[in-house]
């Protein structure tokens, strides 16, 4: 997956830091105070969407072959830049009963991006 460097507008991973204070969660999330969540941004032109390296799945690669040939119903489908690899993160927080919970939360951090 590409890292966004400001030079290309192709689907890439953009760094983004989430501060729990910014969204009002700081009074119940004990740690961390924030984290690099990141997000996906950029274009998914046909020639990119069809390559398995940047594609979300074999399925989207196959569908894209039909889309490029103008086959209905895929002709007007747009390929989107989405997370293809996500990573968990450990969090310490208060649950609904004010008990302290330590949990590895799945899909917290965007590691790589690709075209759907």
């Amino acid at each position: 997956g590409l890292e966004c460097d400001g030079k290309v507008n192709i689907c890439c991973k953009k760094q983004f830091f989430v501060s729990f204070k910014d969204i009002g969660w700081n009074d119940w999330i004990i740690a961390p105070s924030g984290y690099h969540a990141n997000y996906c941004e950029g274009e998914c032109p046909s020639h990119i969407a069809g390559t398995s390296g940047s594609s979300l799945s074999f399925h989207s690669t196959v569908i894209n072959h039909y889309r490029m040939r103008g086959h209905s119903p895929f002709a007007n489908l747009k390929s989107c830049c989405v997370p293809t690899k996500l990573r968990p993160m450990s969090m310490l927080y208060y649950d609904d009963g004010q008990n302290i919970i330590k949990k590895d939360i799945q899909n917290m951090i965007v590691e790589e991006c690709g075209c759907s």
């Epitope: 009002g24 119940w28 927080y93 649950d95 609904d96 949990k103």
Partner: antibody, heavy 123, light 108 residues
Framework: QVQLVQSGAEVKKPGASVKVSCKAS????????MHWVRQAPGQGLEWMGV????????NYAQKFQGRVTMTRDTSISTAYMELSRLRSDDTAVYYC????????????????WGQGTLVTVSS | EIVLTQSPGTLSLSPGERATLSCRAS???????LAWYQQKPGQAPRLLIY???SRAGGIPDRFSGSGSGTDFTLTISRLEPEDFAVYYC?????????FGGGTKVEIK
């Protein structure tokens, strides 16, 4: 300590509207969703809808779609529920209740409730 | 929508007895998203149990919750005078949020 303080009792005529307020204190207001639940005399609890104070996004029960509007003023940590075109069967106690609607963490129970606001609809 | 059916509607028991309240869901509810509330006359509901089996802060250990899938139970091991009230189950896994019809625990 966490407190949800609601506005006082209201008496309304059929066809009118009512706006109930719920002032939050003791916690970070935008960090918790605010739900509204009503209870008709001698009846059970009925969920009306929810507002995310951070974004203003709402989700209403189908029964109340088109008649209910939930808003908030984050500057004064207050949520509002307005019900229009009132009928006699809208006579009930209306509660606000906070929750963190975050399924990934197993969160979402209504841990604090307002004291309730009695709305009487009568001609 | 997920329909929650509570039984019995009324439970007549004496102080010191064991109370068993049932909540059945129309479709499977992950046990992480089932709560029980207690309501006394003229008061707002109070959270007793969340995540089907975890007690909320300040709730005595005579209250316990269990169950999974579609069948959940609230048990009060030994009824105290202050436990006579109405109890509601609620699911918070899906919108619309729904409550059971309630079980009234009254003094026999």
């Amino acid at each position: 300590q966490v407190q949800l303080v609601q506005s006082g009792a209201e008496v309304k005529k059929p066809g009118a509207s009512v706006k109930v307020s719920c002032k939050a204190s003791g916690y970070t207001f935008p960090g918790y969703h605010m739900h509204w639940v009503r209870q008709a005399p001698g009846q059970g609890l009925e969920w009306m809808g929810v507002i995310n104070p951070s974004s203003g996004d709402t989700n209403y029960a189908q029964k109340f779609q088109g008649r209910v509007t939930m808003t908030r003023d984050t500057s004064i940590s207050t949520a509002y529920m307005e019900l229009s075109r009132l009928r006699s069967d809208d006579t009930a106690v209306y509660y606000c209740a906070r929750a963190r609607d975050i399924a990934a963490l197993g969160l979402g129970a209504f841990d604090y409730w307002g004291q309730g606001t009695l709305v009487t609809v009568s001609s | 929508e997920i329909v929650l059916t509570q039984s019995p509607g009324t439970l007549s028991l004496s102080p010191g007895e064991r109370a068993t309240l049932s909540c059945r869901a129309s479709q499977s509810v992950s046990s992480s998203y089932l709560a029980w509330y207690q309501q006394k006359p003229g008061q707002a509901p109070r959270l007793l149990i969340y995540g089907a089996s975890s007690r909320a802060g300040g709730i005595p250990d005579r209250f316990s919750g269990s169950g999974s899938g579609t069948d959940f139970t609230l048990t009060i091991s030994r009824l105290e005078p202050e436990d006579f009230a109405v109890y509601y189950c609620q699911q918070y896994v899906a919108y619309p949020r729904t409550f059971g019809g309630g079980t009234k625990v009254e003094i026999k």
